[in-house]
C-alpha cells in the first residue's frame, strides 16, 4: 500500500546503557485536542482527498504494523520479522533497547472498509540513541516504585534532572490511555493505591530549527508494600519428628513464608546434624509456590533415595534467611513400627 | 445524606456479571474523580479502578485488568463498575470514593459498600 500519505510523527529513544529498559509505540497516539486524519480517495485523483477523523484508539485492536527497510525493499511485517518486538493491540513493545531499532515503523487498521479506502495509517520515525549526557547522574529510575496507602511520585526519565520551572509540558499516558490532566516532568500520587501500578509513558516535544521530535521514556511502576520487620517463618515441616520406612526414598519439604522486601535475597537450605558435624546437603532448586504483594512461600526439598539406619540418627535441618534473621526447623526420622 | 450510595451487589455464580453503580451527592463527578475499592476480610484494602470524569481518564488494578469496566455518567451523577467473569477470589465488599482532583490525589469520601459474594 501506498504510505505517502501516512500522517508522520518523529520520535527519539534515548536509553540508558546502564539499565534494562522498554520502549513502546501507539499507533494512534490520541494527542490532547487533535484526532488523526487519514485519507479517503475519491474516483478523481484530482480531488482534494477528504479529511476523516482516524478511527478512535478503541476501534484499533486489530492494526497491523510493518517496517519500512531503509534500503527501499517492501515494507516487513513486524511479527515475522522482529521476535524481541511483541504487538499488543494497538501497541508496539520494544523489549530491548539498542540503535538497531531505529527505523520507520508503519501501522494501519488490517480491516480496510471501501476499495475506495487508503488505509488510515501512522508513520513513525524512529531514533535510538545511547544516553551520554553524563551530567545527570541521578536520573530516574525506568523502573518505578510506589508505596501503598502513602504518598509518591512518578517522575519521567528523561527530564528527572530538569527543575520543574523549566521542564517542557509532558504528556502521560499509562497503559497506552492518555492521562490529559497530568502535564509536568512528575505525576504527585497523594495516595498510592494498586490502579497506579502499570506501564507509564511520558512524551516532550524537543524542537530545532529545523524540526521537532517526540522525546519518550517507559516507567514500569510497581505499587509495594512496606518491607517486611519479621524474619521468614517455616510453614512446613511442622512437627520435629518424621516416621520413616527404612529402605524406602522419602522426600521432605521445607516451605518458608517470606515478607515483601525490595531488594529480596531469600536463603532456604538443608543440612544434616550428625553428631558433631554438620553439613550442607546438595539439593533441588528453591521454587517459588505462592506471590502475593506481601509475601512469598518458597519450598525446596530434601530427597532421600532410601531412608538407612544411619539416617534415624541425623537431625535434618532446614535453614531459612531474610535480611531481618534466620529461622529453623530440625525434624528427627524414627522408624514406622508394625 | 451520605456523599456516596453504592449499590448493585449480591450473590453471583463464578463467570457470571454484575455491575455496581455509586451516586455521588453533594458535589459534582466533573470536579473529582472517583475509585472502586474493595474489602475481603482479613485483607489490605484494594484500589480496583478509578475515573476522572473530567477527561475521561481511567486506571485499573492488574488484579481486574480487562474483566471489569468503569465509566461515569455525570448527567446522573453516577460511576458504574462493570464486573464481567467473576472468580471466587472476587468475593469482598465493594466500596466507592471521591479522590480529590485527578485518581492520583486523596480520597477524601467514602461510601458504605455494597457485598459482593461469587460462589463457585
Known amino acids: 500500500f501506498n504510505i505517502s500519505g501516512c500522517s508522520t510523527k518523529k520520535l527519539l529513544w534515548t536509553y540508558s546503557t546502564r539499565s534494562e529498559e522498554e520502549f513502546v509505540l501507539f499507533c494512534d497516539l490520541p494527542e490532547p485536542q487533535k484526532s488523526h486524519f487519514c485519507h479517503r480517495n475519491r474516483l478523481s485523483p484530482k480531488q482534494v482527498p477528504e479529511h476523516l477523523p482516524f478511527m478512535g484508539s478503541n476501534d484499533l485492536s486489530d492494526v497491523q504494523w510493518y517496517q519500512q527497510p531503509s534500503n527501499g525493499d517492501p515494507l516487513e511485517d513486524i511479527r515475522k520479522s522482529y521476535p524481541h518486538i511483541i504487538q499488543d493491540k494497538c501497541t508496539l513493545h520494544f523489549l530491548t533497547p539498542g540503535v538497531n531499532n531505529s527505523g520507520s515503523y508503519i501501522c494501519r487498521p488490517k480491516m480496510i472498509k471501501s476499495p475506495y479506502d487508503v488505509a488510515c495509517c501512522v508513520k513513525m520515525i524512529l531514533e535510538v540513541k545511547p544516553q551520554t549526557n553524563a551530567s545527570c547522574e541521578y536520573s530516574a529510575s525506568h523502573k518505578q516504585d510506589l508505596l501503598l496507602g502513602s504518598t509518591g511520585s512518578i517522575s519521567c526519565p528523561s527530564l528527572s534532572c530538569q527543575s520543574d520551572a523549566q521542564s517542557p509540558a509532558v504528556t502521560w499516558y499509562k497503559n497506552g490511555k492518555l492521562l490529559s490532566v497530568e502535564r509536568s516532568n512528575r505525576i504527585v500520587v497523594d495516595e498510592v493505591y494498586d490502579y497506579h501500578q502499570g506501564t507509564y509513558v511520558c512524551d516532550y516535544t524537543q524542537s530545532d530549527t529545523v524540526s521537532s521530535w517526540t522525546v519518550r521514556a517507559v516507567v514500569q511502576v510497581r505499587t509495594i508494600v512496606g518491607d517486611t520487620k519479621l524474619k521468614p517463618d517455616i510453614l512446613d515441616p511442622v512437627e520435629d519428628t518424621l516416621e520413616v520406612e527404612l529402605g524406602k526414598p522419602l522426600t521432605i519439604s521445607c516451605k518458608a513464608r517470606f515478607g515483601f522486601e525490595r531488594v529480596f535475597n531469600p536463603v532456604i537450605k538443608w543440612y544434616i546434624k550428625d553428631s558433631d558435624l554438620e553439613w550442607e546437603v546438595s539439593v533441588p532448586e528453591a521454587k517459588s509456590i505462592k506471590s502475593t504483594l506481601k509475601d512469598e512461600i518458597i519450598e525446596r526439598n530434601i530427597i532421600l533415595e532410601k531412608v538407612t539406619q544411619r539416617d534415624l540418627r541425623r537431625k535434618f535441618v532446614c535453614f531459612v534467611q531474610n535480611s531481618i534473621g534466620n529461622t529453623t526447623q530440625s525434624v528427627q526420622l524414627k522408624e514406622k513400627r508394625g | 445524606d451520605v456523599p456516596l450510595q453504592e449499590s448493585g451487589g449480591g450473590l453471583v455464580q463464578a463467570g457470571g456479571s454484575l455491575r455496581l453503580s455509586c451516586v455521588a451527592s453533594?458535589?459534582?463527578?466533573?470536579?473529582?474523580?472517583v475509585g472502586w475499592f474493595r474489602q475481603a476480610p482479613g485483607k489490605e484494602r484494594e484500589g480496583l479502578s478509578c475515573i476522572s470524569s473530567s477527561d475521561g481518564s481511567t486506571l485499573y488494578a492488574d488484579s481486574v485488568k480487562g474483566r471489569f469496566t468503569i465509566s461515569s455518567d455525570n448527567a446522573k451523577n453516577t460511576v458504574y463498575l462493570q464486573m464481567n467473569s467473576l472468580k471466587p477470589e472476587d468475593t469482598a465488599v465493594y466500596l466507592c470514593?471521591?479522590?480529590?482532583?485527578?485518581?492520583?490525589?486523596?480520597?477524601?469520601?467514602w461510601g458504605q459498600g455494597t457485598q459482593v459474594t461469587v460462589s463457585s
Open positions: 470514593a471521591a479522590v480529590r482532583g485527578s485518581c492520583f490525589g486523596r480520597t477524601t469520601h
Open positions: 453533594g458535589f459534582a463527578l466533573d470536579e473529582i474523580a
